[in-house]
Interface confidence: low
């Protein structure tokens, strides 16, 4: 239904609190360098304006689109060109081109310092003195570092943050209470960020059809008792919601997401038997709970997939009459039978089935041609299963840090031209797959591993796109989204790479490493490891182990020394010499 004033409509639907949070996220994702104070001023102005439109939908400018209103606000910021350079050129355009222009200037790797968590006491004081401002800062800091973060989900994490602080700030040992709880929220939020970026990449590069296929597979796995028509409706809605959020229409996105949650809860009987617990929660928690819902039980009486898609004599006729519906039905039927497969794998199988029909239905004896298609799926299924098996075994043997290092060596050899910070970030994230997935029951491992790896590799692609340096990475990133992970897995040592010169300063360390938190120490060591591989791409595992072991001992020894600076200054050159020798 059309509304006279879009902004009044959204304000009424969302409520002031969520409206303000979403506007703050929107501004922070568009203008990532502006300080909180500047954004909050704009948020208040937009909120006050929305309230006037609620009171009188015919008031001046209330009929303007939200993009127009937001864009006008952003373009009115003084010194926009000084701070944002060519982004200011967007302001010369009209909607919808202006918004498209803003979207293109979103920076996936903004030059911002890492988000530092304040000390527990200070955190609690500022939270208790002004919880709204404290959580506003949280939204701002996360949104500007993750310009594609799914906005309604970020509101949910802010709510979680709020709950943790409220609980822990009245405890005697605040830090002991806060640290593990906030670490857990942070970990979940970071995974959510890369997953959503992948969804937006899918939408941007391959359009709504590709995203909807992903949604059909995912929904079919979760709700195997739902009819195909129901799954299609849910997938269409989810596609619309994600398109809105990826496109910067955050108010509409959050509103539609709440509507979808409402619809699902009103139609549990035709969707899933597992929804009730979610449906009793408030709106943000309800939507999040539904997004994370466990799979419903698979119906006991499902016939073989072959009946309708291989043995039926009308396969080619059904395919020709309505290709998308027929392939959608195949994806639905296959996915609901396989909650143990990754969505990427299910989409590869659907693609293989489509290619088989395209070829066979044009031949003289189609049934004879496509009759073996299900058997031809086997190698496609075995490949990710083997990937999971070998990587989980390696993780169990080495632990998270050792596994990250193994992945770092592997990926530096595959793409040594990529910058060391990007390789270290990617390897650390890829390496976390072990902790995240390898401890799960067998049936959950494959979907967890492959879909997580795909999201992390998408982040690598997004960063590489900004400054392309490796032809191999470009090739894997340019292809289909579902083929990326197999493409990266298949890469071997880049033979075209000319090894980096050995620079002593790259391996020179100072006493400041001693006071770093464990995570930062690990990153320093992993940076050195990547640089070693760039110097000697064909170094053996034993050579690298020797050098890294020597390095760890050197750091340990000097950090325990009475005169740390002197130890680093004198022992450092010896370490460099020994390392060069070990790698010769």
């Amino acid at each position: 239904e059309a509304h006279k004033s879009e902004i009044a409509h959204r304000f009424k639907d969302l409520g002031e609190q969520h409206f303000k949070g979403l506007v703050l996220i929107a501004f922070s994702q568009y203008l990532q360098k502006c300080p909180y104070e500047e954004h909050i001023k704009l948020v208040q102005e937009v909120t006050d304006f929305a309230k006037t439109c609620v009171a009188d939908e015919n008031a001046e400018n209330c009929d303007k689109s939200i993009h127009t209103l937001f864009g006008d606000k952003l373009c009115a910021i003084p010194k926009l060109r000084d701070n944002y350079g060519e982004l200011a050129d967007c302001c010369a355009k009209q909607e919808p081109e202006r918004n498209e222009c803003f979207l293109q200037h979103k920076d996936d790797n903004p030059n911002l310092p890492p988000f530092q968590r304040p000390e527990a006491e200070a955190m609690c004081t500022s939270f208790q003195e002004n919880p709204t401002s404290f959580l506003g800062h949280y939204l701002h800091e996360v949104a500007r570092r993750h310009p594609y973060f799914y906005a309604p989900e970020l509101l949910y994490y802010a709510e979680k943050y709020n709950e943790v602080l409220t609980q822990c700030c009245t405890e005697s040992d605040k830090a002991a209470c806060l640290t593990p709880k906030l670490d857990a929220v942070k970990e979940k939020a970071l995974v959510a960020a890369v997953r959503q970026r992948m969804k937006c990449s899918s939408m941007q590069r391959f359009g709504e059809r590709a995203f909807k296929a992903w949604a059909v597979a995912r929904m079919s796995q979760r709700f195997p008792n739902a009819e195909f028509a129901e799954i299609t409706k849910l997938a269409t809605d989810v596609t619309k919601i994600n398109k809105e959020c990826c496109h910067g229409d955050l108010l509409e996105c959050a509103d539609d997401r709440a509507e979808l949650a409402k619809y699902m809860c009103e139609n549990q009987a035709t969707i899933s038997s597992k929804l009730q617990a979610c449906c009793d929660k408030p709106v943000l928690q309800k939507s999040q709970c539904l997004a994370e819902i466990e799979h419903d039980n698979i119906p006991a009486d499902l016939p073989s997939i072959a009946a309708d898609f291989v043995e039926d004599k009308e396969v080619c006729k059904n395919y020709a009459e309505a290709k998308d519906v027929f392939l959608g039905t195949f994806l639905y039927e296959y996915s609901r039978r396989h909650p143990d497969y990754s969505v990427s794998l299910l989409l590869r199988l659907a693609k293989k089935y489509e290619a088989t029909l395209e070829k066979c239905c044009a031949e003289g004896d189609p049934p004879a041609c496509y009759g073996t298609v299900l058997a031809e799926f086997q190698p496609l299924v075995e490949e990710p299963k083997n990937l999971v098996k070998t990587n989980c075994e390696l993780y169990e043997k080495l632990g998270e840090y050792g596994f990250q290092n193994a992945v770092l060596v592997r990926y530096t050899q595959k793409a040594p031209q990529v910058s060391t910070p990007t390789l270290v970030e990617a390897a650390r994230n890829l390496g976390r797959v072990g902790t995240k997935c390898c401890t799960l029951p067998e049936a959950q491992r494959l979907p967890c591993v492959e879909d997580y790896l795909s999201a992390i590799l998408n982040r690598l692609c997004v960063l590489h796109e900004k400054t392309p340096v490796s032809e191999k990475v470009t090739k894997c990133c340019s292809g289909s989204l579902v083929e990326r992970r197999p493409c990266f897995s298949a890469l071997t040592v880049d033979e075209t790479y000319v090894p980096k010169e050995f620079k002593a300063e790259t391996f020179t360390f100072h006493s400041d490493i001693c006071t770093l938190p464990d995570k930062e120490k690990q990153i320093k060591k992993q940076t050195a490891l990547a640089e070693l591989v760039k110097h000697k791409p064909k170094a053996t595992e034993d050579q690298l182990k020797t050098v890294m072991g020597d390095f760890a001992q050197f750091v340990d020894k000097c950090c325990k020394a009475a005169d740390k600076d002197n130890c680093f200054a004198t022992e450092g050159p010896n370490l460099v010499a020994r390392s060069k020798e070990a790698l010769a």
Epitope: L135, T166, C169
Partner: nanobody, 123 residues
């Protein structure tokens, strides 16, 4: 059903004292952190003080430090606020509140409230 009932407000001269009480029921008082919040005429809500469930953690807003004392009696399910050296700017409705697992982000809407008790400081 959660109930918080404040009492002890009234009119007092600058420099005077009052003791506010808050009787709690309908939730696990002895395991809940409690707060006092106030709202001066025509102003927004202002956090005054927090006390943890076991009373080991106590915090005050800068504006009341050294003058107000928060305390609780878990056996009686009651929260207190002793207010000394009262000033004209302390005039407000005082509410006691306890956190409710959040339905919104970072706002006082996250709390269960009492109906408030009015404190007026005037010469």
């Amino acid at each position: 059903e959660v109930q918080l009932v404040e009492s002890g407000g009234g009119e007092v001269q600058p420099g005077g004292s009052l003791r506010l009480s808050c009787a709690a029921s309908g939730f696990a008082f002895s395991t809940s952190g409690m707060v006092w919040v106030r709202q001066a005429p025509g102003k927004g809500l202002e956090w005054v003080s927090t006390i943890s469930d076991d009373a080991r953690i106590i915090r005050y807003a800068e504006s009341v430090k050294g003058r107000f004392t928060i305390s609780r009696d878990n056996a009686k399910n009651t929260l207190y606020l002793q207010m000394n050296s009262l000033r004209a700017e302390d005039t407000a409705v005082y509410y006691c509140a306890t956190y409710r697992a959040g339905s919104r982000i970072g706002s006082y809407e996250d709390y269960y409230w009492g109906q408030g008790t009015l404190v007026t400081v005037k010469p």
